[in-house]
C-alpha cells in the first residue's frame, strides 16, 4: 500500500493489502477500503465499469466475469487498486470480440486471463492455419494481447487467443480482425468530360470518380471562385477490401448562361487532396463559326489542282454540308470530317478538291453548313490564271493592224516591227489604241484586250509582231509587209508562240 | 452496467443545426464503436455515421456534407452535428455501441421535430 | 454504397408457420451481417450477428444462413412476442447500411 508524509492526503488503503488476488470460482470475493474520505468502488473489465458506494465490495459467489481491477478512490480523488483473478477451469479466458485495427497502429484483442498461472498465453490462427510470419504480439493477461503494428494484410483474420491449462492447449472464441487502411496516397479523381458546351435550358451533368482505400475519404465538387453547394448524387462500391470507387455526379437541370465556369471535383484524405476540373461554357442559341484554311481569293494555274480547305466550329452538330458552284452542287470531289475524334469535338474540316482547272472554271465557289440553330457560308473567288490566247489578228480597211488577245491576268499587247528579213523585232511601235473589252463583263475568267497600230507608218518590207503576254505566259502573231510600187500588201499573217 | 442515453433538443426550426449528444457508461469510448442511428416516424432504420474508437469519423455518403461527429473521451461523450436542417429530418436519433457482434446496446433514442 | 434488399416489406403469419425474412446485399459483405428486432416506440435489439450466431438472450427458434450474398432470417414456430418489425443491418464497410425493414404480424 502507498504511504505519504503527515499531512498530505493519502490513498485509501486495500484489505487484503495486495497487488492482485486469485479466487476459486464460487468463493467469495471479500475486498475492504479503508479511508474516512471513502467515496466508491470502481470495478474495471474489458472496458466496462461498474461502481459500488459501500466500502466493501462483497461477492459472495464469484464467478469468471468478476475478474478484473478493482479501484478504491477516496473524497481527494487518490485511488488504490487490485486486480482479482477469479480462476475457473471452464472459463480461461474472458472475451470482446470487438477487434478493430488501424494499418500500422497496434490494437488489443481483448482476451484477459481468469488464471494468470497458465502458460503459453498467445495468439493461434483458426482451423489451425497458421499467423502471418511478421505480425508480433504483446501478451498481458490483465489485459489481452496486443498485434503490433497491424498491416493491411491481416484484414478480416481470424485468430483465437491460447493458452496451456494444465498440459492442455484451451483456445479463446474467434476473433475476427477487421482492419482499417491508413491512407498512404492521395485520392486518385478523374472527370468525364473536360469540357462541356451547351445550349442555354440544356441539363449540364458531368460525373467525378474518386478511387481510394476506403470510404472515409472526403469528396465534394466546387463551383470556382463560388461558396455556393451544389448538388451532387453518389454512387459507391468496395472492389475488394481496400480498392474503393464513388462517382460523384453533378447536375444542373437546366443550365444558364450565367453556370458557365469551371468546375472543380475536390477530393482529400489524411494523406493529402487531388482534384480535377471541367469547364462548362453555356451559350443562349447554337453557331457556326468558319475559317478558311487558305485565302478565300485563289489564283491558280491552267491545268493546275487546287484544294479549299475550310475549317468550322458548329454547335450542335453540323447537319447539312455542301459545296456550290454557279448554283450547282457539287455531289463528289469534297469531303467533311471532324477534326478530332474527341467526344466533345465541335471542330470540323471541309476540303474540295478541284483538280486540272481549266480557264473556264474559275468563279466563286461556295461552302455552306448549317446545324439546328444557324446558317453559314463561306465564297472563294476562283481566279485561273491563263496564258493569253491571240483571238483575232487583222488588217482593217482603215490601214490599221489589230490585235485582239484573251487571257488572265489581263494581257498586255506589244507591238514590234522587223525591218527586211531580220528575226528579231526589237522596235517597237506604239499603239494608237488599246482596249479591254469585257472589263465591265462577268467578274471571272479570261480579259479580252484590243490594241491597235497605224500600219501607214511602216516604209520598208519586213514582219509586224503582235506579242501578248502576261504572268503565265506569251503569244505572238505575225504580219508580213511587203511594197509593190506605192502599194503595200499584206502577206500572210501567222501566229508564233514564243514560251 | 453499459449504458448509452442521447440528449438534444426536441424541437430545431428548419435551416438550423442539429447538436445531440450521446452519453455513455460502463465502457470506453477508446476502445468501441459508437453509432449514430436515426428512424422518420413510420420509416426504416437510416444509419447516419460513426465515431470509431480511435477517434476517425465515417459518414452516411447522403448526410456527410452537413454532418459533423465528435467526442469528448474525458466526459464520456460523442456529439453530432447537423446543419441546414429540414422537415424530412424529422426522426428519432440513437446512439449504439457497436462490438464484432453487431450492435449490442442502444440509447432510448431522442425525438427530434424539425418545424417553424 | 452496399445496398440491403429486404423481403418482404410485411407478412402475417400463423404461430405454427415458419417465417423467413431475406436480405440481397448489392455486392459481397462476407459474413458481416446482422439482424435486429424492434417493437413500437422501443430501440432495436440484436437477434443475430455473423449471420448464423445468436447473441445473448435470443430464443433458438431464431436462426440465420447465407446463401451468396443472399441471407435469411428463420423464425421457427414463432410467438405473439415475435410481432414487430425485423431489419438486416450491413457492417462489412462503412458506410453501413440498413434494410427497409419487415413488418411481422401474428394472427
Known amino acids: 500500500q502507498p504511504s505519504v508524509s503527515p499531512g498530505e492526503p493519502s490513498p485509501p488503503s486495500i484489505h487484503p493489502a495486495k497487488s492482485e488476488l486469485i479466487v476459486r470460482v464460487g468463493n467469495e470475493i471479500r475486498l475492504l477500503c479503508i479511508d474516512p474520505g471513502f467515496v466508491k468502488w470502481t470495478f474495471e473489465i474489458l472496458d466496462e465499469t461498474n461502481e459500488n458506494k459501500q466500502n466493501e465490495w462483497i461477492t459472495e459467489k464469484a464467478e469468471a466475469t468478476n475478474t478484473g481491477k478493482y479501484t478504491c478512490t477516496n473524497k481527494h480523488g487518490l485511488s488504490s487498486s487490485i486486480y482479482v483473478f477469479v480462476r475457473d477451469p471452464a472459463k480461461l479466458f474472458l472475451v470482446d470480440r470487438s477487434l478493430y485495427g488501424k494499418e500500422d497502429n497496434d490494437t488489443l484483442v481483448r482476451c484477459p486471463l481468469t488464471d494468470p498461472e497458465v502458460t503459453s498465453y498467445s495468439l493461434k490462427g483458426c482451423q489451425g492455419k497458421p499467423l502471418p510470419k511478421d505480425l508480433r504480439f504483446v501478451p498481458d493477461p490483465k489485459a489481452g494481447i496486443t498485434i503490433k503494428s497491424v498491416k493491411r494484410a491481416y484484414h478480416r483474420l481470424c485468430l483465437h487467443c491460447s493458452a496451456d491449462q494444465e498440459g492442455k492447449s484451451v483456445l479463446s472464441d474467434k476473433f475476427i480482425l477487421k482492419v482499417r487502411p491508413a491512407f498512404k496516397a492521395v485520392p486518385v479523381v478523374s472527370v468525364s468530360k473536360a469540357s462541356y458546351l451547351l445550349r442555354e435550358g440544356e441539363e449540364f451533368t458531368v460525373t467525378c470518380t474518386i478511387k481510394d482505400v476506403s470510404s472515409s475519404v472526403y469528396s465534394t465538387w466546387k463551383r470556382e471562385n463560388s461558396q455556393t453547394k451544389l448538388q451532387e448524387k453518389y454512387n459507391s462500391w468496395h472492389h475488394g477490401d481496400f480498392n474503393y470507387e464513388r462517382q460523384a455526379t453533378l447536375t444542373i437541370s437546366s443550365a444558364r448562361v450565367n453556370d458557365s465556369g469551371v468546375f472543380m471535383c475536390y477530393a482529400n484524405n489524411t494523406f493529402g487532396s487531388a482534384n480535377v476540373t471541367t469547364t462548362l461554357e453555356v451559350v443562349d442559341k447554337g453557331f457556326i463559326n468558319i475559317f478558311p484554311m487558305i485565302n478565300t481569293t485563289v489564283f491558280v494555274n491552267d491545268g493546275e489542282n487546287v484544294d479549299l480547305i475550310v475549317e468550322y466550329e458548329a454547335f450542335p452538330k453540323p447537319e447539312h454540308q455542301q459545296w456550290i458552284y454557279m448554283n450547282r452542287t457539287f455531289t463528289d470531289k469534297w469531303e467533311d470530317y471532324p477534326k478530332s475524334e474527341n467526344e466533345s469535338n465541335i471542330r470540323y474540316v471541309s476540303e474540295l478538291h478541284l483538280t486540272r482547272l481549266k480557264g473556264t472554271e474559275g468563279g466563286t465557289y461556295t461552302f455552306l453548313v448549317s446545324n439546328s440553330d444557324v446558317n453559314a457560308s463561306i465564297a472563294f473567288n476562283v481566279y485561273v490564271n491563263t496564258k493569253p490566247e491571240i483571238l483575232t489578228y487583222d488588217r482593217l480597211v482603215n490601214g490599221m493592224l489589230q490585235c485582239v488577245a484573251a487571257g488572265f491576268p489581263e494581257p498586255t499587247i506589244d507591238w514590234y516591227f522587223c525591218p527586211g528579213t531580220e528575226q528579231r523585232c526589237s522596235a517597237s511601235v506604239l499603239p494608237v489604241d488599246v482596249q479591254t473589252l469585257n472589263a465591265s463583263g462577268p467578274p471571272f475568267g479570261k480579259l479580252v484586250v484590243q490594241s491597235s497600230i497605224d500600219s501607214s507608218a511602216f516604209k520598208h518590207n519586213g514582219t509586224v509582231e503582235c506579242k501578248a503576254y502576261n504572268d503565265v505566259g506569251k503569244t505572238s502573231a505575225y504580219f508580213n509587209f511587203a511594197f509593190k510600187g506605192n502599194n503595200k500588201e499584206q502577206i500572210h499573217p501567222h501566229t508564233l508562240f514564243t514560251p | 452496467q453499459v449504458q448509452l442515453k442521447e440528449s438534444g433538443p426536441g424541437l430545431v426550426q428548419p435551416s438550423q443545426t442539429l447538436s445531440l449528444t450521446c452519453t455513455v457508461s460502463g465502457f470506453s469510448l477508446t476502445s468501441y464503436l459508437v453509432h449514430w442511428v436515426r428512424q422518420p416516424p413510420g420509416k426504416t432504420l437510416e444509419w447516419v455515421g460513426l465515431m470509431w474508437n480511435d477517434g476517425d469519423t465515417s459518414y452516411n455518403s447522403a448526410l456527410k456534407s452537413r454532418l459533423s461527429i465528435s467526442r469528448d473521451t474525458s466526459k464520456s461523450q460523442v456529439f453530432l452535428k447537423m446543419h441546414s436542417l429540414q422537415a424530412e429530418d424529422t426522426a428519432t436519433y440513437y446512439c449504439a455501441r457497436e462490438s464484432n457482434l453487431g450492435f449490442t446496446y442502444w440509447g432510448h433514442g431522442t425525438l427530434v421535430t424539425v418545424s417553424s | 454504397d452496399i445496398q440491403m434488399t429486404q423481403s418482404p416489406a410485411s407478412l402475417s403469419a400463423s404461430l405454427e408457420e415458419i417465417v423467413t425474412i431475406t436480405c440481397k446485399a448489392s455486392?459481397?459483405?462476407?459474413?458481416?451481417l446482422s439482424w435486429y428486432q424492434q417493437k413500437p416506440g422501443k430501440s432495436p435489439q440484436l437477434l443475430i450477428y455473423d449471420v448464423t450466431r445468436l447473441a445473448d438472450g435470443v430464443p433458438s427458434r431464431f436462426s440465420g444462413s447465407r446463401s451468396g450474398t443472399q441471407y435469411s432470417l428463420k423464425i421457427s414456430r414463432p410467438q405473439v412476442a415475435d410481432s414487430g418489425i425485423y431489419y438486416c443491418l450491413q457492417s462489412y464497410s462503412t458506410p453501413y447500411t440498413f434494410g427497409a425493414g419487415t413488418k411481422l404480424e401474428l394472427k
Open positions: 455486392q459481397g459483405i462476407d459474413d458481416d
